[in-house]
Amino acid sequence: TEVKVTQPEKSVSVAAGDSTILNCTVTSLLPVGPIRWYRGVGQSRLLIYSFTGEHFPRIRNVSDTTKRNNMDFSIRISNVTPEDAGTYYCVKFQRGSSEPDTEIQSGGGTEVYVLAK
């Protein structure tokens, strides 16, 4: 059965300087491969967070993703700035063998509105 990626909120509003949570759950961890968050779409999309061990300033996972059955890949963005506004996508990849990982499913996106303090 196909993996489903769910982003329950179509949009969230957050005041500049505050934190916000972007929710994302998946229905399966198979096929194996990382889950990443992007802002925007297409060639110009920006990698925001990857659940592959690297450190990303201001962003952290919400749940304990070291649980082997974890299906919650929500993130918290701290100290939000106006530059953080945009649509965020939670994306499930299948690991590549000798080629790059392949995107297999994306959530519907969550638009982040940043309000003036």
Epitope: V32, G53, D64, R68, N69
Partner: antibody
């Protein structure tokens, strides 16, 4: 520098118990899942237990399930393996290992020898 | 018995290329790693996530995968590479960490 130092090994009689410890330093222990891997004399590697970073979820192969218990104390940066109902076939060097994001192992301790013998 | 299969031994002359294979896991549910172990020492991680090499590991060690078989390649083998090499995996479908039985690499001469 990541360091993992095991202790608590020794000689124990069949049916006995032993608790191994692994002191971790050089990384944020509370952010990493951890595992125990053993190696019987002259044999290959065998994974025996894993635990999530927060300690709430544990994992075991059938060979030790119900006899071994993995736990951790993040305030002390220490990993534990409680071994009960020990058998001769549990004789091995026991290594603690840090897990990567996808549950492979990137750093290993030097190991501690457990001998189960009457 | 071991869930992953690798050859018991491989022999190679210094300067040549050694290849050690590992099979048995489902490609859709497994990640793979390679570990080196010298006599009396703890294992050392050479490759993780199929083909990622820790920063302290020489570039002559590389990992690759094709279908359900993964391969450790050691280019320009040196005498110090003589050791046991273990293929290890993480199986997402069972939450377990199987190993291969190990391959003894002998450097001839």
């Amino acid at each position: 520098e990541v360091q993992l130092v095991e202790s608590g090994g020794g000689v124990v009689q069949p049916g006995g118990s032993l608790r191994l410890s692994c002191a971790a330093s050089g990384f944020t222990f509370s952010s990493n899942a951890m595992s125990w891997v053993r190696q019987a004399p002259g044999k290959g590697l065998e994974w025996v237990a894993g635990i999530s970073a927060g300690g709430s979820d544990t994992y075991y192969p059938a060979s030790v399930k119900g006899r071994f218990t993995i736990s951790r104390d993040n305030s002390k940066n220490t990993l534990y393996l409680q071994m009960n109902s020990l058998r001769a076939e549990d004789t091995a060097v026991y290594y603690c290992a840090r897990e990567t994001w996808n549950h492979l192992f990137d750093y290993w301790g030097q190991g501690t020898l457990v001998t189960v013998s009457s | 018995s071991y869930e992953l299969t690798q050859p018991p031994s491989v022999s190679v002359s210094p300067g040549q290329t050694a290849r050690i294979t590992c099979s048995g896991g489902s490609y859709s549910s497994y990640y793979y790693a390679w570990y080196q172990q010298k006599p009396g020492q703890a294992p050392v991680t050479l490759i993780y996530s199929d083909d990622k090499r820790p920063s302290n590991i020489p570039e002559r060690f590389s990992g690759s995968s094709s279908g359900t078989t993964v391969t450790l390649t050691i280019s320009g083998v040196q005498a110090e590479d003589e050791a046991d090499y273990y293929c290890g995996g993480y199986d997402q479908s069972s939450y377990t960490n199987p190993f291969g039985g190990g391959t003894k690499l002998t450097v001839l001469g």
